[in-house]
């Protein structure tokens, strides 16, 4: 659009159709030329008695911002736009006021006005600029950091997006995007955007805000991914019914409406366009999400963004396909689904669907949780995720939950993208009516993912009630147990079985109390024999205060429904036999370990047996296979090179959030029992 006061006078023109649509993270040149018939400029403006004055502004609903002013060959740029805007052709071509804008972000959308004043003459032209596209963090269904470079791209493509570029992530960061999760980008680098640096998220920038980078990585390494969804012509719509839909029913319902299940990318675009739904729905990748554009406490914890409902409290796993939610459909024809076999697979081969049940609850509800960082246990890893150096971030692991004991129950937790920086990068709704404790004891950062189970020998509490048929305390050990798959995955029944399988029994409240009094601390809620759920805290800290505020003690959630899922506390008395450590040059796969122990008239030791052996003085600085497929090692005399500064049985996990059993084909030492 162009205007001038009258013919034959100053005229300004932007020869581009409006609106101009440009991609997030790209650069933009808006041509602006002016003709000044009264004062043709034939020499540099500085020689003219009255030089024209050029002013560029951006106008949005909220305000008008002057970007720069130029006159007499000098350009004064608004300090907030110092490295962002320029006049590339001025003053070399004095009548060319073309504006260049670098690294466009969503906030750069608006009406741009090129205004030229010369004496009493004044003329302007405008152009609407729409910055299109959104960057979002994407994690595979199974767990964190599972995508190699190929799979990362595939994940984006299957969600109506492409892998984001560093420029796009930078632009999203400048728009306020904050995510403490390392993700692939198109140039094969791995980065993550941090506004509020904190331990675990410092990366290569220490305490300075900015996009962290690990540089170019080997394509076989695994991380999450940052995707970029450009635009869509169709529409995202919600389908609902009183009884909601299973995943299959949701897909059918969308088809019935002449649509199909929307992808995560399409939902992000709809959210960016203002979509706001306080109800979670199925998407094409079997995830369950909901878009929040108007912050309110009872819908996603007062935060903006696309929220995600996860299966587990550590924000991994998608809900059981038979659980019921709304259906989120997409009506457009502008996306053509890429068949699964075009990525060389018949489906997500790295997915395990784990099913849990939880009460039928209204979603979403307000329980805020903040993910903490990797500041919990001493950590070593079986499968290095990246070169661990002092600055290698361990974004968001383990998750810490801010306790609010009296809040209602929900199974939604958070998502990634929020429109604004947050004090903690991701907040979501927790999965229980109290603060779920974080992982246990702080310890020095190591180079692999081991959990430090600080285990203590138990002595009897005076006057503690005898439990019929239960081994008494002296000489026994209470230990926290978690199956390899995930945190908080055991029903009461499964918890009892798990202890029995490890050669132990489920601990009683008295045994846990005795262990606590002997110094045992574990910030993980676990079943006890009386169907209560408790955890012992010697040094209270925010995510572990439970029902005791800042006082030390055994926290309790009271008697819980047996279908709820937690970890478990087991008790092992004395060892009836011996645990021995075996190694060889090429070490053993899990299967080979089983066979080897059998060939030596023994069995693979159980977790309980290893704890009992540790209690009797077994000290080995090498992790070995146990009968449940876990990898552990007993430390009696702590030393810096062997799992930290406390005695205990260390567990080696596959993932930094302390879940996942090692690959049975990986090779390790062995603990046998005879």
């Amino acid at each position: 659009e162009e205007t001038s006061d009258h013919d034959n006078s100053l005229s300004v023109s932007i020869p581009e159709p409006s609106p101009m649509r440009v991609l997030l993270g790209s650069s933009l040149t808006i041509p602006c030329y002016f003709i000044d018939p009264m004062h043709p400029v034939t020499t540099a403006p500085s020689t003219a008695p009255l030089a024209p004055r050029i002013k560029w502004s951006r106008i949005t609903k909220e305000k008008e911002v002057v970007l720069l002013v130029a006159t007499e060959g000098q350009v004064r740029i608004n300090s907030a736009y110092q490295d962002k805007v320029s006049l590339p052709n001025y003053p070399a071509i004095p009548s060319d006021a073309t504006l260049e804008i670098q690294n466009l972000r969503s906030n750069d959308s608006g009406i741009y006005r090129c205004e030229v004043m010369h004496g009493i003459e004044d003329s302007e032209a405008t152009l609407e600029v729409v910055v299109k596209g959104i960057v979002f963090h994407y994690r595979a269904i199974s767990t964190r950091y599972t995508l190699d470079f190929d799979r990362a791209q595939r994940a984006c493509l299957q969600n109506s997006a492409i892998i984001a570029t560093p420029e796009q992530l930078q632009a999203a960061y400048e728009d306020g995007f904050h995510q403490c999760d390392a993700g692939w980008l198109a140039d094969q680098t791995v980065r993550y955007p941090i506004h509020t640096p904190r331990e675990g998220c410092y990366g290569d920038k220490d305490e300075f805000p900015g996009v962290r980078t690990y540089g170019i990585r080997d394509t076989n390494e695994t991380y999450d991914v940052y995707c970029f969804a450009e635009e869509m012509e169709g529409e995202v719509l919600y389908a609902t019914s009183p009884e909601k839909f299973t995943f299959q029913e949701a897909a059918n319902e969308c088809r019935r409406l002449g649509a199909r299940l929307a992808t995560t990318g399409q939902l992000y675009l709809a959210w960016q366009g203002g979509m706001d739904m306080c109800s979670a729905g199925w998407l094409a990748d079997r995830s369950v999400r909901y878009p929040i554009s108007k912050a309110r406490p009872n819908c996603g914890g007062n935060l903006l963004g696309v929220r995600t409902v996860y299966l587990h409290a550590n924000q991994t796993g998608y809900p059981d396909p038979s659980s019921r939610y709304d259906a989120i459909c997409y009506t457009g024809e502008d996306f053509v689904d890429i068949p699964e076999n075009f990525f060389g697979v018949g489906g997500e081969e790295d997915i395990t669907i784990q099913t849990v049940t939880w009460p039928d609850v209204e979603l979403p509800l307000p329980r805020n949780i903040t993910e903490g960082e990797a500041r919990g246990n001493v950590i070593l890893t079986v499968k290095p995720i990246f070169d661990l150096s002092p600055t290698a971030p361990e974004p968001e692991e383990p998750f810490t939950f801010v306790p609010e004991p009296e809040k209602p129950f929900t199974f939604a937790t958070d998502v990634g993208v929020t429109a604004f920086p947050e004090a903690e990068n991701r907040t979501g709704e927790a999965t229980r009516p109290w603060g779920v404790p974080e992982e246990s004891t702080p310890g020095p950062a190591f180079t692999a993912f081991t959990s430090e189970d600080h285990v203590v020998q138990v002595t009897a509490v005076p006057g503690a009630a005898e439990v019929p048929g239960q081994p008494r305390l002296p000489g026994g050990v209470v230990f926290h147990y978690r199956p390899g798959s995930a945190r908080y995955s055991l029903t009461f029944e499964e918890a009892q079985q798990a202890c029995l399988r490890t050669g132990a029994v489920i601990a009683s409240p008295e045994q846990l109390q005795a262990a606590y009094e002997a110094g045992y601390e574990q910030c993980d809620a676990g079943w006890l024999q009386d169907q209560t759920v408790r955890y012992p805290i010697v040094s209270p800290r925010t995510p572990c205060v439970g029902d005791k505020d800042s006082s030390p003690g055994v926290r309790t959630y009271g008697v819980r429904p047996p279908s709820e899922t937690y970890d478990v506390y087991c008790y092992v008395d004395k060892l009836e036999g011996e645990v021995f450590f075996i190694t060889r040059l090429e070490q053993f796969t899990f299967q080979e370990a089983l066979a080897f122990c059998e060939s030596h008239n023994a069995t693979l030791a159980s977790t309980g047996q290893l704890y009992a052996a540790w209690r009797q003085g077994l000290d080995k600085c090498y992790a070995g296979w146990l009968s449940d497929g876990s990898l552990r090692y007993p430390i009696v005399t702590p030393r810096p090179s062997c799992g930290g500064d406390k005695p205990g049985v260390r567990t080696v996990y596959l993932y930094p959030n302390q879940t996942g059993l090692p690959d049975p084909l990986s090779r390790h030492h062995v603990f046998c029992f005879r």
Epitope: D150, Q153, T165, E230, E231, F335, V336, D337, I338
Partner: nanobody
Framework: EVQLVESGGGLVQPGGSLRLSCSAS????????MFWVRQAPGKDYEWVAS????????YYDDSVKGRFTISRDSAKNTLYLEMNNLKPEDTALYFC????????WGQGTQVTVSS
């Protein structure tokens, strides 16, 4: 600005061969999966072949397996589709794509297989 420009189409007899090219610009070609998609008159889009960013993995629709070969030259930012033993049912408009969003594809190049 992202641009994909296909070329190499034409009229060919059954059993003949063609080599399609797609010149890419405006994005990190070497870091992108790439695809060939086709649309026969009055039919839906059909994914023909895909290649990962390194060129180490290729996948084909069953209807073209053994006859078509997808490849890439990252130094030249170019994607190729070598088509041998062409059949009349291969007649279609062939598009080079880097995403499932139709609006981001090239204009296409016409392949007609007819005697």
């Amino acid at each position: 600005e992202v641009q994909l420009v296909e070329s190499g189409g034409g009229l060919v007899q059954p059993g003949g061969s063609l080599r399609l090219s797609c010149s890419a610009s405006g994005f990190t070609f070497s870091g992108s999966w790439m695809f060939w998609v086709r649309q026969a008159p009055g039919k839906d889009y059909e994914w023909v072949a895909s290649i990962n960013s390194s060129g180490g993995r290729t996948y084909y629709d069953d209807s073209v397996k053994g006859r078509f070969t997808i490849s890439r030259d990252s130094a030249k930012n170019t994607l190729y589709l070598e088509m041998n033993n062409l059949k009349p049912e291969d007649t279609a408009l062939y598009f080079c794509a880097r995403s499932p969003r139709v609006g981001s594809w090239g204009q296409g190049t016409q392949v007609t297989v007819s005697s």
